[in-house]
């Protein structure tokens, strides 16, 4: 593995980020701020890229499937949370197929820097960004009900994930700005059609003294819809990410329907993840246990066909689920929990100024801002053996109650050598079915003077496609030294976030 010039791999970095965005099922499109590091390795006729990308969340939902640079700033003026991130990415390209970049794996960490950037020395904090977005599901439901009254096409949509919640307090009242994804849940789905997803932005206004959030004085909502039938694999891996998922044998193209607009509504655009309080449920029940009762349960795993199981399925909470090796010395290839909790019960900060909500939580219960050399977490194992569920063409979100006995896909795919999947306490291992690819891991908000902790770098081994020795892993350990001709320059637009990124990596 050799260091390379950050500016030389810009096309690969830009394409890789697009592929990562297209793989994600929730959250907001990442936009590239800077290539922080770049190495490459040549294996036969394949180039393996090891990239470190500094990113920032846009205000466009990943469901839009837009290219990251095509996310226009919205026309409306809503409080926009500034969330930065860093992604470690492994991608490959075959020399004879110059366009054929594939993202093999990625790990990202993200964190809000809004409060760290706010100068609140002489002034009250009037804008809050809430981490515990799930608390505002009622407001999202109320807003969606209003939208349904004005838009018959939305009659069968239900709230899926609450993505962002901001509160603004002003002289004339208080406003809550709630972003959430929605999902079409038609009553009759035989034969089952792919789910249609949407994204809504609701503004709810209350009198200054209002204690009851049930009855806003004013409610404005706008939604747009994204139809996977007209979409580039919203339901799974887009081209160049592995084998595309199929719906009834048809690949989908990449256009979106125009936004639904109520008569006389504003082009109102426009900026976390739910987590439980209390111990996490046993792994087999996790998918269906958090949040309010169905139909307002967790967002879905993406449907998949069996042929694609060795590629990605997507987790529900930004931090995707991972399979775990049963070897206790190396239990977690990515060491990420899907539900962002503190199994050890420690809150990452004793107190966050201006933030009175629970934060997305850190899996080991320790302050996320201490650096772990080489991207490793301080614990050598996961306290809970969470594993991915691999539903047979089906996922359970706001639409479906989960069946008692879930089928698994990938029959006939044995585990990769040495891989077993833990089922949790007392359950014993069972064969590995699907390896999860990629994770986005939300950390608590950064404070002034803190920098974003580096993402994990200990990716599992993978065989290169078209390789002579498919069982021989071809990726090297992710490079820890920084390339001399890196990092690249920050792209213009948000120079003030540069202070939150490390400029060098641990040697």
């Amino acid at each position: 593995v050799s260091p390379t010039d950050c500016s030389a791999v810009e096309p690969e970095a830009e394409k890789a980020l697009d592929l990562i965005n297209k793989r994600r099922r929730d959250g907001y499109l990442f936009q590239l701020l800077r290539i922080a590091d770049a190495h490459l390795d040549r294996v036969e006729n394949t180039t393996v890229y090891y990239l470190v990308l500094d990113v920032q969340e846009s205000d466009c939902s990943v469901l839009s499937r837009k290219y990251w640079n095509d996310c226009e700033p919205p026309d409306s003026r809503r409080p926009s949370e500034i969330v930065i991130g860093q992604c470690k990415v492994i991608a490959t390209r075959h020399s004879h197929e110059s366009q054929d970049l594939r993202v093999i794996d990625f790990n990202c960490t993200t964190s809000s820097v809004s409060s760290a950037l706010a100068n609140t020395k002489d002034s009250p904090v009037l804008i809050d960004f809430f981490e515990d977005t799930e608390r505002y599901r009622k407001q999202a439901n109320k807003a969606l009900e209003k939208y349904k009254e004005e838009n018959d096409d939305f009659a069968s949509f239900r709230v899926d994930r609450i993505e962002r919640v901001a509160r603004v307090r002003g002289g004339e009242g208080t406003g809550y700005f709630v972003d959430f994804s929605v999902r079409n849940c038609p009553r009759h789905h035989f034969p089952r059609h792919p789910n249609v997803f949407g994204f809504c932005r609701a503004d709810l206004f209350y009198d200054v003294e209002a204690l009851d959030l049930e009855s806003p004085k004013n409610l404005v909502i706008n939604c747009e819809v994204f139809d996977p039938q007209e979409h580039e694999n919203i339901n799974g891996v887009p081209p160049h990410l592995g084998h595309p998922f199929h719906w009834g044998g048809h690949e989908r193209s990449s256009t979106t329907k125009p936004p639904f607009k109520p008569h006389g509504s504003r082009d109102h655009h426009h900026p976390h993840k739910p987590h439980e309080h209390g111990p996490p449920p046993p792994p087999d029940e996790r998918d269906h246990s958090h949040g309010p009762p169905l139909p307002q349960g967790p967002p879905p795993l993406l449907p998949m066909s069996c042929s694609s199981c060795q590629h990605a399925t997507f987790g529900t909470n930004g931090a995707q689920r991972h399979s775990h090796n049963n070897n206790s010395s190396d239990l977690h290839p990515h060491k990420h929990h899907s539900h962002e909790q503190h199994p050890h019960g420690h809150h990452p900060h004793a107190h966050h100024p201006h933030e009175h909500d629970t934060h997305r939580q850190h899996p080991h219960g320790h302050h996320p801002h201490g650096h772990h050399p080489h991207g490793h977490h301080p614990h050598g194992h996961h306290p809970h053996g969470h594993h991915p569920h691999c539903h047979d063409f089906q996922d359970y979100g706001p639409c479906d109650p989960p069946p008692h006995n879930q089928g698994h896909c990938c029959h006939g795919h044995g585990p990769p050598p040495g891989h077993l999947r833990r089922r949790g306490p007392g359950k014993g291992p069972r064969p590995f079915h699907c390896r999860q690819i990629g994770s986005v891991y939300r950390l608590p908000p950064l404070r002034k003077g803190e920098v974003l902790p580096l993402p994990e770098a200990n990716f599992p081994s993978f065989p290169l496609p078209h390789h002579k020795h498919p069982l021989k892993p071809d990726n090297q350990p992710f490079p820890q030294s920084v390339s001399e001709s890196c990092p690249g320059k920050f792209k213009s637009g948000f120079p003030q976030v540069s202070m939150f990124f490390t400029h060098t990596f641990p040697k």
Epitope: R77, S114, L117, A118, N119, H263, R266, G493, Q496
Partner: antibody, heavy 118, light 108 residues
Framework: QVQLQQSGAELMKPGASVKISCKAT????????IEWVKQRPGHGLEWIGE????????NYNEKFKGKATFTADTSSNTAYMQLSSLTSEDSAVYYC???????????WGQGTTLTVSS | DNVLTQSPAIMSASLGERVTMTCTAS???????LHWYQQKPGSSPKLWIY???NLASGVPARFSGSGSGTSYSLTISSMEAEDAATYYC?????????FGGGTKLEIK
Amino acid sequence: QVQLQQSGAELMKPGASVKISCKATGYTFSSYWIEWVKQRPGHGLEWIGEILPGSGRTNYNEKFKGKATFTADTSSNTAYMQLSSLTSEDSAVYYCARYSYFYYFDYWGQGTTLTVSS
Amino acid sequence: DNVLTQSPAIMSASLGERVTMTCTASSSVSSSYLHWYQQKPGSSPKLWIYSTSNLASGVPARFSGSGSGTSYSLTISSMEAEDAATYYCHQYHRSPWTFGGGTKLEIK
């Protein structure tokens, strides 16, 4: 309490440039859009554009693109509007205002009178 | 651009008289995004009525606002001397945000 304090009146020659300032106090300057509005006698109020100081993001009314340029300094909580290639048409009172996030402008500066005359 | 036309441009009213002024938009505006500002000579505009019908803090109850779509109005139930000012309507529905030309209200 929230206040927007604008720089004093300016008398400029045609073709020159001028930079008007708007100092904000009493709130988190970086988090709210600063709006710029032009008022000429008999022409009512015209929205020029806006800047979000925390990010430097700007939006301009098409009509004022090339005429106005917005900047902001978060260390001094001050927003600036530079007007270039001045003509008599630019003679007006210029206001900065804060966007409330409730779809209206809740606080206004006292205005800066610009006179362009040879 | 959404052009807002206010009428009348100038009006005078006796003390105690009921006053109504209108604001007509060239394209539809959601009521959440239509506001009124009051401006007195030598002063900055002040938010007066927001989202069509809500009085800003400190605005007397004799003021009211109504309307929908392209037609909005501001009404004073009983004119008082301090109400003499210019009133501007403003839409924040679609950029560029626009203002009406103003209605100047004088005391007769």
